[in-house]
Interface confidence: low
């Protein structure tokens, strides 16, 4: 693994992909989605210490300024770098429709 | 303004573009950048309450799950939606070079 992928806080504590099991009710989708009734939501969770999975130059700047001015500038945060598509079966006036969402499930994560 | 642009926490407290004045030393660039010696860094800072500048479906999911499981799922966070380019005059072995960075200054912000 690259240096930027080693978590100095201990295994699993830095920014990475997590899976959270959720029902349609949990997601607030029960009134417009028929299926799936439960979703394995992949999302990005974890700390962003210095140099860990920095997305770009902006993230580097943010970390340096956070060190200097922690009350003003927050640390970079863990967000999706890309997404996996997901198909939802939706309720419509006439029945059902299949709709693909490209921005629903995180595929991998980085710090911005 | 759209509903998603009204900050329920009070003016200026939600996710928005901020400008932070920084020197090359602040940024950790003094050893490889000649100019500019000081930069007005634009970055995204602020809270991401429900429905505020949600970037996508993933952000909606994250907020709903954060409400349910605040200890497990963090709230969406404020990150750049796009960037402005910036040219740095860099030190090289032979003198100086101009290099454009496309991911350095935040242009606008959203919650992910």
């Amino acid at each position: 693994a690259r240096n930027g992928d080693r978590c100095p806080l201990g295994p699993g504590r830095c920014c990475r992909l997590h899976t959270v099991h959720a029902s349609l009710e949990d997601l607030g989708w029960a009134d417009w989605v028929l299926s799936p009734r439960e979703v394995q939501v992949t999302m990005c969770i974890g700390a962003c210490p210095s140099q860990f999975r920095e997305a770009n130059m902006h993230a580097q700047i943010k970390m340096n300024l956070h060190r200097l001015k922690p009350d003003t500038v927050p640390a970079p945060c863990c967000v999706p770098a890309s997404y996996n598509p997901m198909v939802l079966i939706q309720k419509t006036d006439t029945g059902v429709s299949l709709q693909t969402y490209d921005d629903l499930l995180a595929k991998d994560c980085h710090c911005v | 303004a759209r509903n998603g642009d009204r900050c329920p926490l009070g003016p200026g407290r939600c996710c928005r573009l901020h400008t932070v004045h920084a020197s090359l030393e602040d940024l950790g660039w003094a050893d490889w950048v000649l100019s500019p010696r000081e930069v007005q860094v634009t970055m995204c800072i602020g809270a991401c309450p429900s429905q505020f500048r949600e970037a996508n479906m993933h952000a909606q999911i994250k907020m709903n799950l954060h409400r349910l499981k605040p200890d497990t799922v963090p709230a969406p966070c404020c990150v750049p939606a796009s960037y402005n380019p910036m040219v740095l005059i860099q030190k090289t072995d032979t003198g100086v070079s101009l290099q454009t960075y496309d991911d350095l200054l935040a242009k606008d912000c959203h919650c992910v």
């Epitope: - | 004045h21 100019s35 500019p36 010696r37 000081e38 930069v39 007005q40 860094v41 402005n84 380019p85 910036m86 040219v87 740095l88 005059i89 101009l98 454009t100 350095l104 200054l105 242009k107």
Partner: antibody, heavy 117, light 110 residues
Framework: EVQLVESGGGLVKPGGSLRLSCAAS????????MSWVRQAPGKGLEWIGM????GTTYATWAKGRFTISKDSSTVYLQINSLKTEDTAVYFC??????????????WGQGTLVTVSS | DIQMTQSPSSLSASVGDRVTITCQAS??????LSWYQQKPGKPPKALIY???ILASGVPSRFSGSGSGTDFTLTISSLQPEDFATYYC????????????FGGGTKVEIK
């Protein structure tokens, strides 16, 4: 090759309007701040204003009558209510970098505007 | 607005002379000052950025110094091609001060 070419100058009557153009080639205008500068015959350089990523900035004396705008490959300077003292060569120039300081690294050859009745 | 005052407005010098031009800002502009050279009928050419950084391709006989309100352009050994008019420019726009030029200094052959 990076190049700026101004056009649109000429003889105009006092009170008239003029739109100068600055065609950019060899680089993307969207990546740079751009400035307009003028020089009256035999006089010094006078900074008019600048268009950045987020808007425009003008010299105090230029606010109101001068407007800078741009599209994908051209920067414009609109001058309204022309006066005889607006007679000058008008240059457009590309800013070397942006973020704090705004030196002008690339210049066009200029276009002459003459205001006379 | 910031005002930039250049001096002298003109000077006569010989090839090989050391030439110094000064520029004073009406208020502090940190180090955000540029110097330009202009020859008759031509657009200006950038010489120095941020008070002391030599622009690409500019001979090392040109140098700049200063910070705050007082700045200097020095030509260590004047060459025939250096006879021209020189301008300083404030490049400080954070507080909407604009980017004014000094009045210029014409360097002529003695």
């Amino acid at each position: 090759e990076v190049q700026l070419v101004e056009s649109g100058g000429g003889l105009v009557k006092p009170g008239g309007s003029l739109r100068l153009s600055c065609a950019a080639s060899g680089f993307s205008l969207s990546n740079y701040y751009m400035s307009w500068v003028r020089q009256a015959p035999g006089k010094g350089l006078e900074w008019i204003g600048m268009i950045s990523f987020s808007g425009t900035t003008y010299a105090t004396w230029a606010k109101g009558r001068f407007t800078i705008s741009k599209d994908s490959s051209t920067v414009y300077l609109q001058i309204n209510s022309l006066k005889t003292e607006d007679t000058a060569v008008y240059f457009c120039a590309r800013v070397v970098y942006a973020g704090w300081t705004y030196p002008l690294g690339i210049w066009g050859q200029g276009t002459l505007v003459t205001v006379s009745s | 607005d910031i005002q930039m005052t250049q001096s002298p407005s003109s000077l006569s010098a010989s090839v090989g002379d050391r030439v110094t031009i000064t520029c004073q800002a009406s208020q502090s502009i940190s180090s955000v000052l540029s110097w330009y050279q202009q020859k008759p009928g031509k657009p200006p050419k950038a010489l120095i950025y941020e008070a002391s950084i030599l622009a690409s391709g500019v001979p090392s006989r040109f140098s700049g110094s200063g910070s705050g309100t007082d700045f200097t352009l020095t030509i260590s050994s004047l060459q025939p091609e250096d006879f021209a008019t020189y301008y300083c420019q404030a490049n400080y726009d954070v507080y909407n001060y604009g980017n004014p030029f000094g009045g210029g200094t014409k360097v002529e052959i003695k």
